[in-house]
C-alpha cells in the first residue's frame, strides 16, 4: 500500500481467483483513543472499533472511502484505491491501446519543434468518474524537470456503437536547449482513476523522435507564362524551431488528380518553391520533414489547381 | 447507454439445472465486465458471480462456488450464468449488470442493470 496522496492511498493486488488478497491496517488520525469506530463510504454498517482497523482487501467491494468516527463526529478519512495485477500483468483498463506505431501503446506524444514544448494524448471509452495526473522529466535516476499541465478533454469521437473521448495534456522541458544532442530521454508518467481502479501508464521518448512540424504555411501558385506549369511557393511554419539556417526542413511537393486513382506527381525538395505541372481539377499539396532527421511529416498544406 | 435483458428463469425442481441468459445492447458490451446478483422477497440484493471484459477471469460468491458458472459470448453480446444443483435457497429475481470494476461484488460499482428474471426452486 502506498499514498497517492493526502489520505487517498493504492493497494496493489496480485488477484487471481480465490487469492486471499491484501492485508491493509487503517489508523485513525486522532489523538483520540477510545469509543472510534469505522464505516465504509456511505453505510452505516459499523466495521470495527478502536484506533486501527485491519482489513483484507481482495476485490474492488472492498474499496471505498474508510471513515472512523467518534460519538457522531467524523474523525479522518481513507479512501483506498486499488491497482490489480492479473498473471503478472498490472491491468490497463482505462486506456485504450491506439496500436500505433506499436501494440501496447496507450500514450502517444508529439513536439512541434525543438523548444522542449511536447503533447501527449491518449483514448478512452469512460466517460464518467475519471481523473488524471500528468508527470514528466527528463531520465529517471537523476530527473531534470518537465512541468505538464492538466490533462482536458481534447475530443469525442463515435466509433460504431462506441463514443470515444480524447484526453491530451501539454509539457514543457524546464531548461530546454533546442541544439543539444539528447542522451537521456523523456519520461511521462500518466496516473488514471475510474471509480476506486488506480492504473500507471508511462511512455519514453526523445524530443527529436516525436516531432511532427506544422504544416507549411502561405502556401501560393504563380501560373508560369506560355505554360502549363507553375511555380508553388511557401513558407516555414510559425511554430517551427529558428534560426531556419540549421532547423532546416525538407518538403514534399504533391500533384493529385481529382481521382485519388490518378498517378500522383511528387518532388521533394530543400527549397521553399518548386515548379509542377498544374494539371485540370488538380491540387498541389506540400508537407515538411526534419532535413536531418527521420521524424514524422507534417500535414499537408493543399491549394487547387484552379 | 447499455440495455440489459435477461431470459432463462423459471420454476425447477431441487438439483436440477437452468441457464440464464442476458443480451446485451448499446454501447459496446466487449468493454464491460458483467455481472449476477440476486434478490430474495425481503432481503438485499446479493452477489452472485461475475466474468472480466476479456472472458478470461471469473469471481463467484462463496454460495454458488462449484455449482455456477458465468461464461459470455462476445459474439453474441450475451452473457449467461449456468445454474446446477439448485436449491430452494437459490429462489430469487436474479439480475444482470455491467460495470468497470473487476472484479466487485458490491453492487454500486455497477452502471447498468437488467429488469430481472425469477427463478423458482421447489423442494
Known amino acids: 500500500i502506498w499514498e497517492l496522496k493526502k489520505d487517498v492511498y493504492v493497494v496493489e493486488l496480485d488477484w487471481y481467483p480465490d487469492a486471499p488478497g491484501e492485508m491493509v491496517v487503517l489508523t485513525c488520525d486522532t489523538p483520540e483513543e477510545d469509543g472510534i469506530t469505522w464505516t465504509l463510504d456511505q453505510s452505516s454498517e459499523v466495521l470495527g472499533s478502536g484506533k486501527t482497523l485491519t482489513i483484507q482487501v481482495k476485490e474492488f467491494g472492498d474499496a471505498g472511502q474508510y471513515t472512523c468516527h467518534k460519538g457522531g463526529e467524523v474523525l479522518s478519512h481513507s479512501l483506498l484505491l486499488l491497482h490489480k495485477k492479473e498473471d503478472g500483468i498490472w491491468s490497463t483498463d482505462i486506456l485504450k491501446d491506439q496500436k500505433e506505431p506499436k501494440n501496447k501503446t496507450f500514450l502517444r506524444c508529439e513536439a512541434k519543434n525543438y523548444s522542449g514544448r511536447f503533447t501527449c494524448w491518449w483514448l478512452t471509452t469512460i466517460s464518467t468518474d475519471l481523473t488524471f495526473s500528468v508527470k514528466s522529466s527528463r531520465g529517471s535516476s537523476d530527473p531534470q524537470g518537465v512541468t505538464c499541465g492538466a490533462a482536458t478533454l481534447s475530443a469525442e469521437r463515435v466509433r460504431g456503437d462506441n463514443k470515444e473521448y480524447e484526453y491530451s495534456v501539454e509539457c514543457q522541458e524546464d531548461s530546454a536547449c533546442p541544439a543539444a544532442e539528447e542522451s537521456l530521454p523523456i519520461e511521462v508518467m500518466v496516473d488514471a482513476v475510474h471509480k476506486l481502479k488506480y492504473e500507471n501508464y508511462t511512455s519514453s521518448f526523445f524530443i527529436r523522435d516525436i516531432i511532427k512540424p506544422d504544416p507549411p504555411k502561405n502556401l501560393q501558385l504563380k501560373p508560369l507564362k506560355n505554360s502549363r506549369q507553375v511555380e508553388v511557393s511557401w513558407e516555414y511554419p510559425d511554430t517551427w524551431s529558428t534560426p531556419h539556417s540549421y532547423f532546416s526542413l525538407t518538403f514534399c511537393v504533391q500533384v493529385q488528380g481529382k481521382s485519388k486513382r490518378e498517378k500522383k506527381d511528387r518532388v521533394f525538395t530543400d527549397k521553399t518553391s518548386a515548379t509542377v505541372i498544374c494539371r485540370k481539377n488538380a491540387s498541389i499539396s506540400v508537407r515538411a520533414q526534419d532535413r536531418y532527421y527521420s521524424s514524422s511529416w507534417s500535414e499537408w498544406a493543399s491549394v487547387p489547381c484552379s | 447507454e447499455v440495455q440489459l435483458v435477461e431470459s432463462g428463469g423459471g420454476v425447477v425442481q431441487a438439483g436440477e439445472s437452468l441457464r440464464l441468459s442476458c443480451a446485451a445492447s448499446?454501447?459496446?458490451?466487449?468493454?464491460?465486465?458483467m455481472g449476477w446478483f440476486r434478490q430474495a422477497p425481503g432481503t438485499e440484493r446479493e452477489f452472485v458471480a461475475t466474468?472480466?471484459?476479456?472472458?478470461?477471469?471469473?469471481y463467484y460468491a462463496d454460495s454458488v462456488k462449484g455449482r455456477f458458472t458465468i461464461s459470455r459470448d462476445s459474439a453474441k453480446n450475451t452473457v449467461y450464468l449456468q445454474m446446477s444443483s439448485l436449491k430452494p435457497l437459490d429462489t430469487a429475481v436474479y439480475y444482470c449488470?455491467?460495470?468497470?470494476?473487476?472484479?466487485?461484488?458490491?453492487?454500486?460499482?455497477?452502471?447498468?442493470w437488467g429488469q430481472g428474471t425469477q427463478v423458482t426452486v421447489s423442494s
Open positions: 449488470a455491467a460495470g468497470r470494476l473487476f472484479p466487485s461484488s458490491r453492487s454500486r460499482d455497477y452502471d447498468y
Open positions: 466474468i472480466n471484459w476479456r472472458g478470461s477471469s471469473t
Open positions: 448499446g454501447r459496446s458490451f466487449s468493454d464491460y465486465e
